[in-house]
Every structure is written in structure tokens, then in C-alpha cells.
């Protein structure tokens, strides 16, 4: 008699990424066989939830539910029904909850405990939901796109499985932005890692990994820039601001009330003789990656070396992967090419500031203007941040890879998240078995 | 300023197809679903299907899979709504709405002007 | 699918006073401790407005003198004291599972 394969053997697991502007989530499956092996867990599906990020509702907690539906039943059909008891789900939440947090612990418990007792009433095996640390966050990502690559397997190979791929065991330092923080993760060469709380230590499929990370609350693209219109309009002269980072002709008023709503701007917060204020862009890169350098402190470093603000920063050491909104931004940009030099990304950021408003309003038609307008700041921050707040260079530039996906599954903290809730990387390397023989009866 | 503006109204003949439009303005059809519903003259409303921009999945009533696609098209961020194998009963108004939350989490709602359709030999 | 009756079939009202209309849903829209039921006004030769969503909850620049209320199968629209713009065509809508439905309508008269 012919050989009858029988029902696939898998796994599924689902992680809600929580972030500041909007929440993903995101549903995973693996050979259940094969848990500990590397590189077998990857992403069957992403749901954006449509709305902005779960602290924005916190003062209508009750309709978090509402706002989750959609991506949940989204889940539910995705994931076979006879799995949904047995699929765990973790909710993370990043630097947006962090902020509410450093506001009211209280709000932001009461956010979580609604987020909780929503995904209670789902099908799945809910784990929780959680204010993740940046240092969390940092070093999830970077297990993330190691694991995706294929670093953390001994099996040394000949040719190239996935991109950016190197063919040697040296894992990649990761790069992600978000719209409230931003972490730098990777390993150093040689180098002690002089603050304490920068340094973490990994054992991973039998290898020890000494790992640099941090993460800097409030310079997320969202925040910095509103760290830079508190700073800017401190020294306006009235209610009209003309802001560089903006292109020329866009205009848009802002409450002086939200301007200083978030935690990232009470440096700069003062009595101003106006309630609102008016953007007017000038669209002028040089004056906007000027205005957003301020936002740095390099003037202090008790360390060796530094990023900036005073945070113990090791020399970078060998391939980066830039995900999240490094990569989004730069892809709207269309500057993710291995091959564009960081000379040609500066020249092109020139010219995509000083166009019109209305031109560039004709030629995205596709696109939120919020989002649409604030492209400039944003890929101009992205410049100022690798090379003056992280010490990249021209040359070192090419070291960094802008990268949205790995192999199917989209770089950020959330696969590795639920790898290391799951149990699913060993410290030391699995045995290697003889082939399966549970395929086929 | 949020704006959806339909096509034009339409004259079809039994048997034919028609492909109505809905484009937005001051809003990115991405950050939500497209739901087109269906009035006939002097009747009520009726919920023909909805479409996630975002990742092209579609949902519909029944009664209506078959005859009816929707898609979209977010460079342009227009919806579509396309019905074919017409008969005298899909005479009607169409309208494409837009409704979730925002990004300070107000629910809101968009509605296109509607398109008549009315279908004659 | 689900079948949305509403009642009355129609309403006379005078301006100032309270409107109260109902919809039987023929099973229930709760789910995931959510009553996925809308209300939408129309006035003629106007596309539909969203007043309520999800039970109880008023959309946006919404007066307010509606309120939702309800669970299970059976939720109400209540307009405390009738203005004169008020007076038109108000539906119910459930969204808990596709195919979406409607109720066939109310409408509200001046008397």
C-alpha cells in the first residue's frame, strides 16, 4: 500500500507588538518536532490593528476590546481550531506604555488590565500582557534577526540561505526605531562593556554571547520630534514657526497643551504667550539635521566613548540589521539598497525636503499627509542618529542593512520574544537526531 | 478635511458590468476597511462586503459572492466595487464607507455621496 | 445570518421629547464580551450617518442626546429630547459575523 502522509505535526503562537503608534500582531508556527532546532519558527501572518497605539486610550480603556477584534478573529481564522486552545499569546507593550507608565502607574495598569481581560475572552492560551524593558526590547530584536539568519546554527555552510548572509557564525548587531524609543544591540569585539547596565550575557544553542544594548526612551521618531518642536519654538519669536525639517508651503497648527502632554518635552517646556502655534515648512535638510543634532548631548560622557546623553556606547563592531521604522522610512524614501552610499542618502534627502508640499501631496496620493508630511524629519533623524548619535560613518554606513524581512518573517522583538517565552532556545546545542520517521505511516 | 468622492452615476443594460469608484482624500484607506452598502429605491440599507486595503482580504455577504469584487488600489487610495451578470433588482444607490479609529482613538465615520445605478434596457 | 427587527416600523414624535427604538437581534451579537451592534441615521437623499457603535458607544461630533444600550439580542436608541434635525431614518447593524446585516429601518416623524 501506498504511504499516507499524516497531518502536519505544528505548532502556533501569537505576539502582539504593542507599540507606541500602533499595535501588530503576529502569528507564528513551527514543526512541533523540531522546536529546539534553529530557524524553524517563522511568521505565517501579521494583522495590523487599525487605530492608534493602545496608550491613547487611555481614557476610553472600555473600548480596547473593540479596537482588538479584528486582528484576533483575524487569528482565529488563520490558526487551525483544533490548535487555538494549545497557541499561547503574549502581549508586549514598548515605549508608548513606558511613557504612560512614567506619567500615571495607575492608567497604565488599568490599560493593561483591559488589554488582559480582552484577549481573556479569546479561544487561545493568553499568557499575559506586559510593559516589556527596553533592554527587553533590544535584545529580543537582536535574537530576532540572528535567529532568522541563521547565526545561532553550528552547521557551517557553503552557499547563502538568506540574505545579508555572511557565511561566517558572527551574529549581526541590530538597529530598530520605533515611534517612542530606539535600541542599539550588538556585540562588541574584545571590548568590556563599561556600564553595567548595558551589558547582557547569552548562552545560546551552546554558545556564550556578550551583549552591548540600550535602549534611549524619547528618541523614537515620534518623540524626537516632538523633542525638537518644544525645543524650536522656545526661541520663536511668535506663534509662526518655520521649520526646516517640513517641506516648503506645509502648514499645520499645533496645541501648545499637546506639545507638552508627553514626558519627552518637559526639558524644554516653558510658559509661551500663545495657546497654539503654526508649523510652515522651509524644507532645508542642512538647517533641519542641525536643528535635530541639538537634541544630542555629546558635550558629556563619563565613559571611554559614547553615544549621546551620556550613555556608554562600545566601537561598533560588524554588520548591522535596521528594522522597523529604520527600514519603513528609508523604504519610503526608497534608499534600502545595499547599494546607495550614505553621501548619495544625504543628497537625496536634500532634494526630497526642499520639494513643495503640494507636489509631494500630488505624487503620494496613497498616503496618510500626517505620515506623508513628516518623512523629511523623519529620514533626516534616521542620518543624525546613526552617524552623529551612534557613530556610524560613511564608510562604516555600508555596514548597515536596512531590512523589513527575514526570510518571510519581519524583523523586530517579537520573534524573539516568544522563542524565549516558548522555551524554544536551548543554551546548549540540541543533539543532533536521526531523521524523523513519523512523516509517513 | 476627509473626503470620499464616488463615480459618477450609471446606466447599464441587463446582463452587463459595471466597476463603481471611491477615492479618498485626507486619509489613507490602509489605516481602515472599505465597506460598501447597497440602497434600493425606497429601501433600506443592505451590507454588500468590506475589504482590508492593507492586505486585499475581502469579506461578502452571500447573496452577493459571485457577482460582486472588491479591490482596491492604495497608490491611489480608491476603492472599487464591481458588479456584474446585472439585473433590473441591482438598481440602486451605492455608497462606500469608511469607519474605525483614529489616531487619537475617536471612532469615526466616512461616507462617499453614492452612485446610482440603474440597470435598463 | 443574523435577522435585525426593529420596532416601530415607524415613530411620531414631538420635538423636545424622548424616541425610544428597538432591535431584536435573532441570536446573539456578543462576543468576546463586545455587543457588536451599530446604529446609523439617514436623512433623505443623504448617505447614512454612525451614531452608536458597538452597543453603547457614540461616534464621533455625535449629540449627546443619543445614547445605545443593550446586550445579547436586544438593544435600544434613545433620543432624550428630539431636536428638529432628528427626524429621520434610523437603522440598527450588527457586525459580529459576516454578513454584516441591517434592520430594515424606523422611521421618525414630527407629530
Known amino acids: 500500500t501506498q504511504n499516507k502522509a499524516l497531518p502536519e505535526n505544528v505548532k502556533y503562537g501569537i505576539v502582539l507588538d504593542a507599540g507606541s503608534s500602533h499595535t501588530s500582531l503576529y502569528i507564528y508556527k513551527w514543526p512541533a518536532e523540531k522546536e529546539n532546532d534553529t530557524g524553524v519558527v517563522h511568521q505565517v501572518e501579521e494583522c495590523r490593528v487599525k487605530g492608534p497605539g493602545i496608550s491613547k486610550f487611555v481614557q476610553k480603556v472600555n473600548e480596547i476590546g473593540i479596537y482588538l477584534t479584528d486582528c484576533m478573529e483575524r487569528a482565529r481564522e488563520v490558526i487551525p481550531r483544533s490548535q487555538h486552545q494549545e497557541t499561547p499569546v503574549y502581549l508586549g507593550a514598548t515605549a508608548g506604555m513606558r511613557l504612560l507608565r512614567m506619567e500615571s502607574e495607575e492608567l497604565a495598569d488599568r490599560v493593561l488590565d483591559v488589554v488582559e481581560r480582552s484577549l481573556s475572552n479569546y479561544p487561545f492560551d493568553f499568557q499575559g500582557a506586559r510593559i516589556i524593558t527596553g533592554q527587553e526590547e533590544g535584545a529580543y530584536g537582536w535574537i530576532t534577526i540572528n535567529y532568522l539568519l541563521g547565526k545561532f546554527s553550528q552547521k557551517t555552510r557553503w552557499f547563502s540561505i538568506v540574505p545579508y548572509e555572511t557565511n561566517n557564525q558572527e551574529t549581526f548587531g541590530a538597529l530598530d526605531l520605533g515611534g517612542a524609543s530606539t535600541q542599539v544591540t550588538f556585540v562588541p569585539q574584545n571590548q568590556t562593556i563599561e556600564s553595567p547596565d548595558n551589558a547582557l550575557q547569552f548562552r545560546l544553542y551552546g554558545k556564550d554571547y556578550n551583549v552591548y544594548t540600550h535602549s534611549f526612551l524619547c528618541y523614537g521618531k515620534d518623540q524626537a520630534l516632538w523633542q525638537k518642536l518644544a525645543k524650536d519654538i522656545q526661541v520663536a519669536s511668535n506663534e509662526i514657526l518655520r521649520d526646516p525639517c517640513f517641506h516648503p508651503g506645509y502648514k499645520k497648527v499645533v496645541n501648545v497643551s499637546d506639545l507638552y502632554k508627553t514626558p519627552c518635552t518637559k526639558r524644554f517646556e516653558m510658559t509661551l504667550p500663545f495657546q497654539q502655534f503654526e508649523i510652515q515648512g522651509i524644507g532645508n535638510y542642512q538647517q533641519c539635521h542641525q536643528s535635530i543634532l541639538e537634541l544630542f548631548n555629546t558635550s558629556y560622557c563619563p565613559y571611554s566613548q559614547c553615544a549621546f546623553n551620556g550613555i556608554f556606547l562600545p566601537p561598533l563592531q560588524g554588520d548591522f540589521g535596521a528594522f522597523s521604522a529604520f527600514y519603513f522610512v528609508m523604504k519610503f524614501l526608497n534608499l534600502t539598497s545595499e547599494k546607495v552610499s550614505q553621501e548619495k542618502v544625504t543628497e537625496m534627502m536634500k532634494k526630497f525636503c526642499a520639494q513643495p508640499w503640494e507636489e509631494i501631496k500630488t505624487s503620494y496620493a496613497g498616503v496618510k499627509e500626517k505620515y506623508l508630511s513628516e518623512y523629511c524629519f523623519s529620514g533626516t533623524y534616521i542620518l543624525s542618529l546613526l552617524l552623529q548619535g551612534y557613530h556610524f560613518t560613511a564608510d562604516s554606513w555600508e555596514h548597515i542593512h536596512f531590512i523589513g524581512k527575514i526570510q518571510g518573517s519581519d524583523a523586530g522583538w517579537t520573534l524573539g520574544y516568544m522563542l524565549n517565552l516558548t522555551n524554544m532556545i536551548p543554551a546548549e546545542q540540541p543533539l543532533s537526531t536521526p531523521l524523523s520517521h513519523s512523516t509517513y505511516v | 478635511q476627509v473626503q470620499l468622492v464616488q463615480s459618477g452615476a450609471e446606466l447599464v443594460k441587463p446582463g452587463a458590468s459595471v466597476k463603481l469608484s471611491c477615492k479618498a482624500s485626507?486619509?489613507?484607506?490602509?489605516?481602515?476597511?472599505v465597506h460598501w452598502v447597497k440602497q434600493a429605491p425606497g429601501k433600506g440599507l443592505e451590507w454588500i462586503g468590506k475589504?482590508?486595503?492593507?492586505?486585499?482580504?475581502?469579506k461578502f455577504d452571500p447573496k452577493f459572492q459571485g457577482r460582486v469584487t472588491i479591490t482596491a488600489d492604495t497608490s491611489t487610495n480608491t476603492a472599487y466595487l464591481q458588479l456584474s451578470s446585472l439585473r433590473s433588482e441591482d438598481t440602486a444607490v451605492y455608497y462606500c464607507?469608511?469607519?474605525?479609529?483614529?489616531?487619537?482613538?475617536?471612532?469615526?465615520?466616512?461616507w462617499g455621496q453614492g452612485t446610482l445605478v440603474t440597470v435598463s434596457s | 445570518e443574523i435577522v435585525l427587527t426593529q420596532s416601530p416600523a415607524s415613530l411620531s414624535v414631538s420635538p423636545g421629547e424622548r424616541a425610544t427604538i428597538s432591535c431584536r437581534a435573532s441570536?446573539?451579537?456578543?462576543?468576546?464580551?463586545?455587543?457588536?451592534m451599530n446604529w446609523f441615521q439617514q436623512k433623505p437623499g443623504q448617505a447614512p450617518k454612525l451614531l452608536i457603535y458597538?452597543?453603547?458607544n457614540q461616534g464621533s461630533g455625535v449629540p449627546a442626546r443619543f445614547s445605545g444600550s443593550g446586550s445579547g439580542t436586544d438593544f435600544t436608541l434613545t433620543i432624550s429630547s428630539l431636536e428638529p434635525e432628528d427626524f429621520a431614518v434610523y437603522y440598527c447593524?450588527?457586525?459580529?459575523?459576516?454578513?454584516?446585516?441591517f434592520g430594515q429601518g424606523t422611521k421618525l416623524e414630527i407629530k
Open positions: 464607507a469608511l469607519y474605525g479609529y483614529d489616531d487619537d482613538a475617536y471612532y469615526f465615520d466616512y
Open positions: 485626507g486619509f489613507s484607506i490602509k489605516d481602515t476597511y
Open positions: 475589504i482590508d486595503p492593507a492586505n486585499v482580504n475581502t
Open positions: 441570536e446573539s451579537v456578543d462576543n468576546y464580551g463586545i455587543s457588536f
Open positions: 458597538a452597543a453603547s
Open positions: 447593524q450588527q457586525s459580529k459575523e459576516v454578513p454584516y446585516t
